[in-house]
């Protein structure tokens, strides 16, 4: 019960981390115009990955996209880069973990299959959550450097009548908002991964050997060897003195991926 | 046709107050910023107030902030501009003025007159 | 806030005339957003309100007659018309959009000879 519930958390929470990514990778509003020193503007600029934005106080706002590729920073083709593939880890991890949902039952999958569906989809959101919180802190590195280097450059050649004001930018909405959703994926996803030891079975399946020894007969159990998962008891090699007679577990056990013959 | 008229206008004793009225018509008015521009008895212009579409943001003279206040009234398709503690200098022709695109007054009314004597 | 300087004062034209004025700002009027400077031209008779000629110191405003043409940017901008007739006998009035407070220039007086 607790696995299902880790699981679904899990998928729940990076399924809004993943909505986040693809709302903040949108959004406009990666950098907007530092007010510090003009609070009152009448002609407010922000920008976004593919597109820069002014916004009037008369209401109307025109927007226009980056239409080159080999002019724009290479900082900014990383950041894109870094978006897309965490939206596209992400999206392919959603995938994934919706067949891997212990709750739904496709066909007679077995739960081996689940945990390693599981344990996929709980990578690709961890690493889908660490792309969109690279993403949102280079661009965010980009922006303190910018915005030193124009506080620079304000204060220099001021010296004749005529001032040029210089457009400063600070962080915009999306970066919080990237910064929290690459969080609730990397969070959803380590919630997947733990889920996945749960799935896994608790006890291998096979049955004891029977070896007839003359004098009195001893079966010997081989145990199965599993990653310690932190959940059930833990696996014991059983020696079970039982005048020959096969035996079974106590405890009942699924086919697992860590069961060898 | 878009139409801007101004009322409320009047002669004050200083430190009285006034508060003039546009009424708007020919237009959305709840889509638009509005603002209220004088001209001084010398011809010169001066931009006094503006209140944004969605009356999130009120801009105002630094002459006339905590004295003046700019409000709207989108059901009646009204402007208003409430002036208190008047001063000679607020004397002047007070219009209503539409903003377009670049911020740009479009519209003007044909304005109402305060003089402000005593 | 920003000083919006006209010159000059008043020009006396025969009609026919190519005229050009000036405005100056105390800073520059340019946003590096879109590139677009943020002044405008208005055109006042006597008795009436301004008139919007031109916005973004060279958009005509719909229904404004092409001798008006405005150039110029960050600080220096001009009002150009070529073949001033009797009814461009006027008073011109440049204004800084930018930032607040939205401030006009001493306005330039047109005056037929």
């Known amino acids: 019960m607790a696995v299902t519930a880790c699981q679904g958390l899990g998928f729940v929470v990076s399924l809004i981390g993943i909505a986040g990514i693809i709302a903040a990778t949108c959004m406009d509003q990666w950098s907007t115009q530092d007010l510090y020193n003009n609070p009152v503007t009448a002609v407010f600029n922000y920008q976004g990955l593919w597109r820069s934005c002014v916004r009037e106080s008369s209401g109307f706002t025109e927007c226009r996209g980056y239409f080159t590729l080999l002019g724009l920073p290479a900082m900014l083709q990383a950041v894109r880069a870094l978006m897309i593939v965490g939206i596209v880890l992400g999206a392919i991890g959603l995938l994934v973990s919706i067949f891997a949902l212990k709750c739904i039952r496709i066909g007679s999958m077995e739960d081996s299959a689940k945990a390693n569906m599981t344990l996929t989809s709980g990578i690709m959101f961890i690493v889908s959550g660490l792309c969109a919180i690279a993403g949102v802190s280079v661009f965010a590195n980009m922006l303190v450097t910018n915005f030193w280097m124009s506080t620079a450059n304000m204060y220099t050649g001021m010296g004749g009548m005529v001032q040029t004001v210089q457009t400063r930018y600070t962080f915009g909405a999306a970066l919080f908002v990237g910064w929290v959703a690459g969080g609730l994926t990397l969070i959803g996803g380590v919630m997947m991964c733990i889920a996945c030891r749960g799935l896994a079975p608790e006890e291998t399946n096979y049955k004891a050997v029977s070896y007839h020894a003359s004098g009195h007969s001893v079966a010997y159990k081989p145990g199965g060897f599993k990653a310690s998962t932190g959940f059930g008891s833990n696996t014991k090699n059983k020696k079970i003195y039982d005048g020959g007679a096969r035996t079974e577990d106590e405890v009942q056990s699924y086919p697992s991926k860590h069961d060898y013959v | 046709d878009v139409n801007l008229v101004e009322s409320g206008g009047g002669l004050v004793k200083p430190g009285g107050s006034l508060k003039l009225s546009c009424a708007a018509s020919?237009?959305?008015?709840?889509?638009?910023?509005m603002s209220w521009v004088r001209q001084t008895p010398e011809k010169r212009l001066e931009w006094v107030a503006t209140?944004?579409?969605?009356?999130?943001?009120?801009y105002y003279l630094d002459s006339v902030k905590g004295r003046f206040t700019i409000s709207r009234d989108n059901a009646k398709n009204t402007l208003y501009l409430q002036m208190s503690s008047l001063r000679s200098e607020d004397t002047a022709m007070y219009y209503c003025?539409?903003?377009?695109?670049?911020?740009?007054?479009?519209?003007w009314g044909l304005g109402t007159s305060v003089t402000v004597s005593s | 806030d920003i000083v919006m300087t006209q010159s000059p004062s008043s020009l006396t034209v025969t009609a026919g005339e190519k005229v050009t004025m000036s405005c100056k700002s105390s800073?520059?009027?340019?946003?590096?957003?879109?590139?677009?400077?943020?002044l405008t031209w208005y055109q006042q008779k006597p008795g009436q309100p301004p008139k919007l000629l031109i916005y973004w110191a060279s958009t005509r405003e719909s229904g404004v007659p092409d001798r008006f043409t405005g150039s110029g940017s960050g600080t220096d901008f001009t009002l150009t018309i070529s073949g001033v007739q009797g009814e461009d006998l006027a008073v011109y009035y440049c204004q800084n959009d930018y930032s607040y407070p939205l401030t006009f220039g001493g306005g330039t007086k047109l005056e037929l000879k």
């Open positions: 020919g237009f959305t008015f709840s889509s638009y910023t």
């Open positions: 800073q520059s009027l340019l946003n590096s957003g879109n590139q677009k400077n943020y």
């Open positions: 209140i944004t579409y969605g009356r999130i943001y009120t």
């Open positions: 003025t539409r903003m377009i695109t670049g911020n740009a007054m479009d519209s």
